[in-house]
């Protein structure tokens, strides 16, 4: 009778084991072990027992002890079970960004690992088990479908293998894949709202605002604003699930014409874009030309208004005849025209909008000086010792200086309150002088003496 010990062994892959082969007869003709494994016999006293060290056990094996005794030949097998954890536990690669509401298939692949009967594959979200299945096939593959939710954002998905050898008196061996961090997002189907001027004047600044609601996570949204080839640099303000991107846009003469304004919102692996056209125009204020801005009374003055070739002008409210970019009027300058404003209003149609520009010039009419009876009476009669204010107003542009002198030496205090004395009596020559000339007027002051009864 041949026996083997141990009859069953579980050992790690590449491990060694001592196997004892025994026989019941005292003087066996043969006693040995049959195995493809590397073996080494340990020397023991006696003939009916042999111990072998079997090494580098890579796979399950059934070494067989045999003996040849006088009463016949017999055999006994030992069962070697090799265990090893999987060489590869991997989640199939997925885009890190996933839209909310999408069915996401998680696929775990497991290569190697034994004994397979004791090997289980577990799919997890964080620590929560989503699916547990025995490892079947090579490579073993376990899949599960997850409906992506907003609260999955930032969640870690992983795959774990469990080699449970506790029934064999060993432990539970776990291997975990690299985690896959899910980034969930919501990008609404509605395009971003773009608010901007439809027309923009050269050498001015405009404000462009791009906004969108219903985004998640809003802080991860990228906003790209551009006018033609010009990238704009917006200031972005975030709400709970919305953003507003505000940018200043400056345009030059090189940008003139129709330009495309784009606002693109990129979130996850999706984008939404809004396009708008902006017409960039050049429209200088009309030019008001006076033959001379300062003229003497009686001078003929031509007032011209010139504007953009496509503009229509009105000069002092009167449209150009024929309607167009030029208007003019002729006048003979009078004192009443001094300070008169000549206003030219130009209108240009740009992309269906009417743009208005104005320019005003003032005419200065030099005239005078003037001294007349109404403003400078020729005769004053005042009672002696009374308080009087001599009034004499000279007119003209520039405003004339006025002096009233008696005998070329005694001034009459114009506009001042004076006590009437005999010295004040006499004829004064009032002279009004300006760059336009000089006029004189005689003013007589009579002083009435008090009557004595």
């Amino acid at each position: 009778q041949t026996s083997v010990s141990p009859s069953k062994v579980i050992l790690p892959r590449g491990g060694s084991v001592l196997v004892t082969c025994s026989t019941s007869c005292d003087q066996p003709k043969l006693l040995g072990i049959e195995t493809p494994l590397p073996k080494k016999e340990l020397l023991l006293p006696g003939n009916n027992r042999k111990v072998y060290e079997l090494s580098n056990v890579q796979e399950d094996s059934q070494p067989m002890c045999y003996s040849n005794c006088p009463d016949g030949q017999s055999t006994a097998k030992t069962f070697l079970t090799v265990y090893w954890t999987p060489e590869r536990v991997e989640l199939a690669p997925l885009p890190s960004w996933q839209p909310v509401g999408k069915n996401l298939t998680l696929r775990c692949q497991v290569e190697g690992g034994a004994p397979r009967a004791n090997l289980t594959v577990v799919l997890l979200r964080g620590e929560k088990e989503l699916k547990r299945e025995p490892a079947v096939g090579e490579p073993a593959e376990v899949t599960t479908t997850v409906l992506v939710r907003r609260d999955h954002h930032g969640a870690n998905f992983s795959c774990r293998t469990e080699l449970d050898l506790r029934p064999q008196g060993l432990e539970l061996f776990e291997n975990t894949s690299a985690p896959y961090q899910l980034q969930t997002f919501v990008l609404p189907a509605t395009p971003p709202q773009l608010v901007s001027p439809r027309v923009l004047e050269v050498d001015t600044q405009g404000t462009v605002v791009c906004s969108l609601d219903g985004l998640f996570p809003v802080s991860e949204a990228q906003v790209h604003l551009a006018l033609g080839d010009q990238r704009l640099n917006p200031t972005v303000t975030y709400g709970n699930d919305s953003f507003s991107a505000k940018a200043s846009v400056s345009v030059t003469a090189e940008d003139e014409g129709t330009q495309r304004l784009t606002c693109a919102v990129i979130l996850g692996n999706q984008s939404q874009e809004t396009l708008q056209t902006v017409t960039i125009y050049s429209f200088p204020a009309p030019n008001v030309i006076l033959t001379k801005p300062e003229v003497s009374e009686g001078t003929e003055v031509t007032v011209k208004c010139e504007a953009h070739p496509r503009a229509k002008v009105t000069l002092n409210g009167v449209p150009a005849q024929p309607l167009g970019p030029r208007a003019q009027l002729l006048l003979k300058a009078t004192p009443e025209d001094n300070g008169r404003s000549f206003s030219c209003s130009a209108t240009l149609e740009v992309a269906g909008q009417l743009i208005h520009k104005n320019q005003t010039r003032e005419l200065r009419v030099l005239y005078g000086p003037r001294l007349d009876e109404r403003d400078c009476p020729g005769n004053w009669t005042w009672p002696e010792n009374s308080q009087q204010t001599p009034m004499c107003q000279a007119w003209g542009n520039p405003l004339p200086e006025l002096k009233c002198l008696k005998d070329g030496t005694f001034p009459l205090p114009i506009g001042e309150s004076v006590t009437v004395t005999r010295d004040l009596e006499g004829t004064y020559l009032c002279r009004a002088r300006s760059t336009q000339g000089e006029v004189t007027r005689k003013v007589t002051v009579n002083v009435l003496s008090p009557r004595y009864e």
């Epitope: 005998d407 070329g408 001034p411």
Partner: antibody, heavy 117, light 110 residues
Framework: QSVEESGGRLVTPGTPLTLTCTVS????????MGWVRQAPGKGLQYIGI?????STYYASWAKGRFTISKTSTTVDLRLTSPTTEDTATYFC??????????????WGPGTLVTVSS | AYDMTQTPASVEVAVGGTVTIKCQAS??????CSWYQQKPGQRPKFLIY???KLASGVPSRFKGSGSGTEFTLTISGMQSDDAATYYC????????????FGGGTEVVVK
């Protein structure tokens, strides 16, 4: 327009002296002319004025000591009886009471009178 | 009598500084006050008339003010060329006068 004094010289006390102011570029019938003097190292002193009508007006201290008269183009200042205190530069001035901004009041260069025995 | 009293008799001022000269009339001369600048050996130069009006060619750093009996000449941003004697003159009455001019103020620029 200009004014220029002449006649200033060394005289002995009590010897009458007449200074003449010659004007050009304006009419004495429409402008008053005055006389101002300045003793060496001293301030300006108003003597008197002749109006466009020919009337004369004097400083209180000058009455009786000076006489102002005019022709169509000249104005005279007569020192009736000079004393050593009358040693000064005498200026002829147009319009001392009638000034416009551009009528840079006209002063002559002055003429020096020295009264000494 | 219409006479003028001027103060101070002399004043020292630094370049860039400001100087104020005052004149008082013995009775109201309204706004008929003129100011002159005189440098040694030269005839007086007309600066201001009617109390505050600048004669042509006079820099705006010269400013006249006042009416009635109190008048002021202010020179701001003083320049070395402004060193001179300044006189006020009443230009209201040519009779009843002792002296139509103030006594003068000598302005020395440091």
């Amino acid at each position: 327009q200009s004014v220029e004094e002449s006649g200033g010289r060394l005289v002995t006390p009590g010897t009458p002296l007449t200074l003449t102011c010659t004007v050009s570029g304006f009419s004495l019938s429409s402008h008053a002319m005055g006389w101002v003097r300045q003793a060496p190292g001293k301030g300006l002193q108003y003597i008197g004025i002749i109006g466009s009508s020919g009337s004369t007006y004097y400083a209180s201290w000058a009455k009786g000591r000076f006489t102002i008269s005019k022709t169509s183009t000249t104005v005279d200042l007569r020192l009736t009886s000079p004393t050593t205190e009358d040693t000064a530069t005498y200026f002829c001035v147009r319009d001392p009471y009638d000034s416009f901004g551009d009528a840079y009041r006209l002063w002559g260069p002055g003429t020096l009178v020295t009264v000494s025995s | 009598a219409y006479d003028m009293t001027q103060t101070p008799a002399s004043v020292e001022v630094a370049v860039g500084g400001t100087v104020t000269i005052k004149c008082q009339a013995s009775q109201s001369i309204y706004s008929y006050c003129s100011w002159y600048q005189q440098k040694p050996g030269q005839r007086p130069k007309f600066l201001i008339y009617d109390a505050s009006k600048l004669a042509s060619g006079v820099p705006s750093r010269f400013k006249g003010s006042g009416s009635g009996t109190e008048f002021t000449l202010t020179i701001s941003g003083m320049q070395s060329d402004d060193a001179a004697t300044y006189y006020c003159q009443q230009a209201y009455s040519s009779s009843n006068v002792d002296n139509a001019f103030g006594g003068g103020t000598e302005v020395v620029v440091k």
